[in-house]
Amino acid sequence: KNLKSPQKVEVDIIDDNFILRWNRSDESVGNVTFSFDYQKTGMDNWIKLSGCQNITSTKCNFSSLKLNVYEEIKLRIRAEKENTSSWYEVDSFTPFRKAQIGPPEVHLEAEDKAIVIHISPGTKDSVMWALDGLSFTYSLVIWKNSSGVEERIENIYSRHKIYKLSPETTYCLKVKAALLTSWKIGVYSPVHCIKTTVENELPPPENIEVSVQNQNYVLKWDYTYANMTFQVQWLHAFLKRNPGNHLYKWKQIPDCENVKTTQCVFPQNVFQKGIYLLRVQASDGNNTSFWSEEIKFDTEIQAFLLPPVFNIRSLSDSFHIYIGAPKQSGNTPVIQDYPLIYEIIFWENTSNAERKIIEKKTDVTVPNLKPLTVYCVKARAHTMDEKLNKSSVFSDAVCEKTKPGNTSK
């Protein structure tokens, strides 16, 4: 009886693992083995595929074959018993195009209100992704173990920190990799769970902002308690993509080591042109807080995107706000020749409830205010250019009282 060729051959490539699966054509014939040949583009001869010769099952692994992953190859399979079937040719394919990204490795560290996620490719020193290793971005899904409500976080790098979590709470997450340059989305890692720690005695500093004064940067932050010392560290932002590199070292700013105020001033020449991350930590001598959330700091934008200045005209039920060009030292206005959007935050002086207005215009009405009530206003500028996408720090708050009830006209 003539042996039939095997059919429906599937090639699965995950990272550097090359797996072939196929269907037996004739289930009734026992003791059949299968063998594959391969052929590279531009070659006439077929070569035996090592790892896939005389296979008794319907699956084989040819990962040991050292292929150029960017070069097209063709496969063929036949069944063998006493005689052999005709060859069945599989459509040619390029391994890199066919390859899927495998699940990444994930390592978690818990803080009281944050989780640090260390992500690395599932296959170390992968041949498949050798030229793309640094182009990997990751996305994750995280949920509270008790609720199951999922939150997705996209476009993160291989070291990421999730903030604003609850202490002593178990969170679970899964991560997948993507190579956006090649339109490849990977498969999720197994689920990893971790419990955040007991709430730290000292909270981290909050609301870190950088501004420019004369030839100095002024770094300010908020802190809950008095009589503390603070330290500030910085990192080249691009190293977030390379956390395994030995250069991934947070560095001290000498003028911001052990400062006793919630601000520090340091010369602009501390930083060359570039994008940096900054973080602040508090200490009372016995205890130390966790590090604050990291803020991104772009020296070029920081140098020119200053907070707006504004005047308020108070009415009984509204404020009219007139936004002007920011002032440099020496009180000269700064010419900002790119379009800006203004974010105006206002609140009743006796309350913490903030309201927000976003406006392109430089004259803005803040409506629905109560008469004879003190309201405070602060504003910041955002660039409208998507590529820049930068923001100034907030201006200092200005507080004004609304007029009595009959002056709205």
Epitope: D125, L134, N242, H246, K249, Q252
Partner: antibody, heavy 117, light 108 residues
Framework: EVQLVQSGAEVKKPGESLKISCKGS????????IAWVRQVPGKGLESMGI????????RYSPSFQGQVTISADKSITTAYLQWSSLKASDTAIYYC??????????WGRGTLVTVSS | EIVLTQSPGTLSLSPGERATLSCRAS???????LAWYQQKPGQAPRLLIY???SRATGIPDRLSGSGSGTDFTLTITRLEPEDFAVYYC?????????FGGGTKVEIK
Amino acid sequence: EVQLVQSGAEVKKPGESLKISCKGSGYIFTNYWIAWVRQVPGKGLESMGIIYPGDSDIRYSPSFQGQVTISADKSITTAYLQWSSLKASDTAIYYCARHDIEGFDYWGRGTLVTVSS
Amino acid sequence: EIVLTQSPGTLSLSPGERATLSCRASQSVSSSFLAWYQQKPGQAPRLLIYGASSRATGIPDRLSGSGSGTDFTLTITRLEPEDFAVYYCQQYDSSAITFGGGTKVEIK
């Protein structure tokens, strides 16, 4: 002005020990790696290892692991390279260099070590 | 350990000519962590290019770097007398930092 000042030339016998130094000034010593580089006369450059004085992190290049010891004293902004038992093949110029994202941006003038019986 | 292979070993050119030096890595190197150095006899090496293409302070624009992955190039558009020296590429993508074997640019 950033400067790396290395200790003077040394002439030693095989089997002897030696410690050479590299003093950094004009920058925040604890914020940069210090690298040690060997150059055998007439040959190329070989990186021996690096140290980060901020946290004393030391990384040796595989071919120098166990052959030399790298250390630093941040209180006097000085890095060291030492041998417990010199060999004739250790004869070379040894450079220290400051290392950060821009590569090895500042170099010492080099210390010539001659090992001969 | 990443091996860097420089070619050619020696380049004999005249002042005013263009020099193209090649550096090939045994595995992919992030272009952020590739540098080029110049060394003259009796002197310490001097940083020319970092991040594969960024010129170090004070380096003239006739020197330029390019490349990514495993293939990198240093180009000197018009050789000046002071450019005749030995040039080394270096990777610091891994903490086992390595240099290429060097290319000597000599006067023809």
